[in-house]
Interface confidence: low
């Protein structure tokens, strides 16, 4: 079933409006500010999600990039445009007419335009970098113990395919996460390693996107990891097109 | 591919029903919508409605209310349009067409090749 | 309801003119804007959605933009596979509203 019967609610996502209005009764949830209906057996693409959260306030991030062609998403929140699948559009433009592209999870990749900006493509965000910073624990952690916590984390709660996460990396006391998915490896049905993240950022900031399940509870051995800082790097098939007016 | 087929011409009696029929294919059928649209002969393009066929949900124009019923089944992957009452100035080619379900994408972008339906005593 | 004004009704051009077909909406639209082509006896073909996207497969001749209010396709260079009837839809709130049409003829 795609939502909770019971009490006609979206397991995965709870920025939805549900009614038991399906075939036969079934409970059908719609996401939030779209009205697109959502597959409530996976997560919802994160353009759905930051759409349903176009109200929120911004939050902006900074700090220094891994590699000359990773992006962080220093714009925050925007409400986007998504296709009919949800996906991001390739070309995203605000009211007062400024467009600019984007990649596959949504952060800009070239210089903001005027509406004759053309983004031929939406190009994929195939390695993710997760760099958390955790709070002082009495010792660090076993990096295996950590590596297989987080992976089952990824597996079980966000339904990745483990092959998706190509590594794990501790130097207390920081983690690194590393997520990778080529246009090629993504097969239907495969959770997208930029819904992952999104669900996961979310869930670190205390702002669970899962209806019910409560907040993130992370355990390695059963010592609590509890995250200080995060921070997201994205980096395209295609590296990004800024002018160097703004990698000064 | 992306395909919608329709249902053959049809004929019908001034107060007779019809229903018509727009069998989908090349894709999974409740990840879009699907509208209505019909064109008198020498005339323009003219919206009917639209049906979720996720939740199974219709919205229908004002002038059609009362008189039409879109439907779908999604275990045939089929939407059908039915209208009533019918009057000489619904002879029309009767076009179903695939939209995405919220309403930055009611745009049309697969059509199926259209219904003639003529009113007639 | 929102109504959509297409002009002109019939326009006369020959093979690589540069044509262009206005569309204006009664109310905001936003960018929600879509751009359509008839051949007779035939189904309408998605040219442009949201004002300036070309649909996948359209040629890059084809052209659209504008927000708000006013809209505009635009062909580069007309090919004579182009002659046909322009619609133009506003795919912002229901109900759906097409402009009357523009039927592009050969000079």
């Known amino acids: 079933h795609t939502a909770a019967q019971d009490n006609c609610t979206c397991p995965t996502n709870k920025m939805t409006v549900c009614s038991p209005d399906g075939p036969g009764g079934r409970c059908q949830c719609r996401a939030l500010g779209s009205g697109m209906a959502v597959d409530c057996s996976t997560l919802t693409s994160k353009c759905l999600l930051l759409k349903a959260r176009m109200s929120a306030p911004k939050n902006a991030r900074t700090l220094v990039r891994p590699s000359e062609h990773a992006l962080v998403d220093n714009d925050g929140l925007y409400d986007p445009d998504c296709d009919p699948e949800g996906r991001f559009k390739a070309r995203q433009c605000n009211q007062t007419s400024v467009c600019w592209c984007v990649n596959s999870v949504g952060v800009r990749r070239t210089d903001k335009g005027d509406l004759s900006l053309r983004c031929d493509e939406l190009v994929r965000t195939h390695h993710i970098l997760i760099d958390l910073r955790h709070r002082p624990t009495a010792g660090a952690f076993n990096h295996s113990d950590l590596d297989a916590e987080l992976r089952r984390l990824f597996r079980e709660r966000y339904r990745l395919h483990p092959k998706f996460v190509a590594a794990v990396h501790y130097e207390q006391p920081t983690i690194q996460i590393e997520l990778r998915q080529n246009t090629s490896q993504k097969a239907a049905g495969d959770v997208d390693i930029g819904d992952a993240a999104y669900y996961f950022e979310r869930d670190i900031k205390g702002e669970s996107l899962f209806q019910g399940r409560g907040g993130l509870d992370l355990r390695v051995r059963g010592e609590p990891l509890q995250v200080e800082r995060t921070l997201i790097y994205y980096l395209d098939e295609i590296p990004p097109k800024f002018s160097m007016k703004r990698l000064t | 591919q992306v395909q919608l087929v329709q249902s053959g011409a049809e004929v019908k009696k001034p107060g007779a029903s019809v229903k018509v029929s727009c069998k989908a294919s090349?894709?999974?059928?409740?990840?879009?919508?699907m509208q209505w649209v019909r064109q008198a002969p020498g005339q323009g393009l003219e919206w009917m409605g639209w049906?979720?066929?996720?939740?199974?949900?219709?919205k229908y124009a004002e002038d059609f209310k009362g008189r039409v019923t879109i439907s779908a089944d999604t275990s045939t992957s089929t939407a059908y349009l039915q209208l009533s009452s019918l009057k000489s100035e619904d002879t029309a080619v009767y076009y179903c067409?695939?939209?995405?379900?919220?309403?930055?994408?009611?745009?049309?972008?697969?059509w199926g090749q259209g219904t003639l339906v003529t009113v007639s005593s | 309801d929102i109504q959509m004004t297409q002009s002109p009704s019939s326009l006369s051009a020959s093979v690589g003119d540069r044509v262009t077909i206005t569309c204006k909406a009664s109310?905001?639209?936003?960018?929600?804007v879509a751009w359509y082509q008839q051949k007779p006896g035939k189904a309408p073909k998605l040219l442009i959605y949201?004002?300036?996207h070309r649909y996948t497969g359209v040629p890059s001749r084809f052209s659209g933009s504008g927000s708000g209010t006013d809209f505009t396709l635009t062909i580069s260079s007309l090919q004579p596979e182009d002659f046909a009837v322009y619609y133009c839809?506003?795919?912002?709130?229901?109900?759906?509203?097409f402009g009357q049409g523009t039927k592009l003829e050969i000079k």
């Open positions: 067409a695939r939209s995405g379900h919220g309403s930055s994408y009611w745009y049309f972008d697969v």
């Open positions: 090349g894709y999974t059928f409740t990840t879009a919508g």
């Open positions: 049906i979720n066929t996720h939740s199974g949900v219709p």
């Open positions: 109310q905001d639209v936003s960018t929600a």
């Open positions: 949201s004002a300036s």
């Open positions: 839809q506003q795919h912002y709130i229901t109900p759906l509203t």
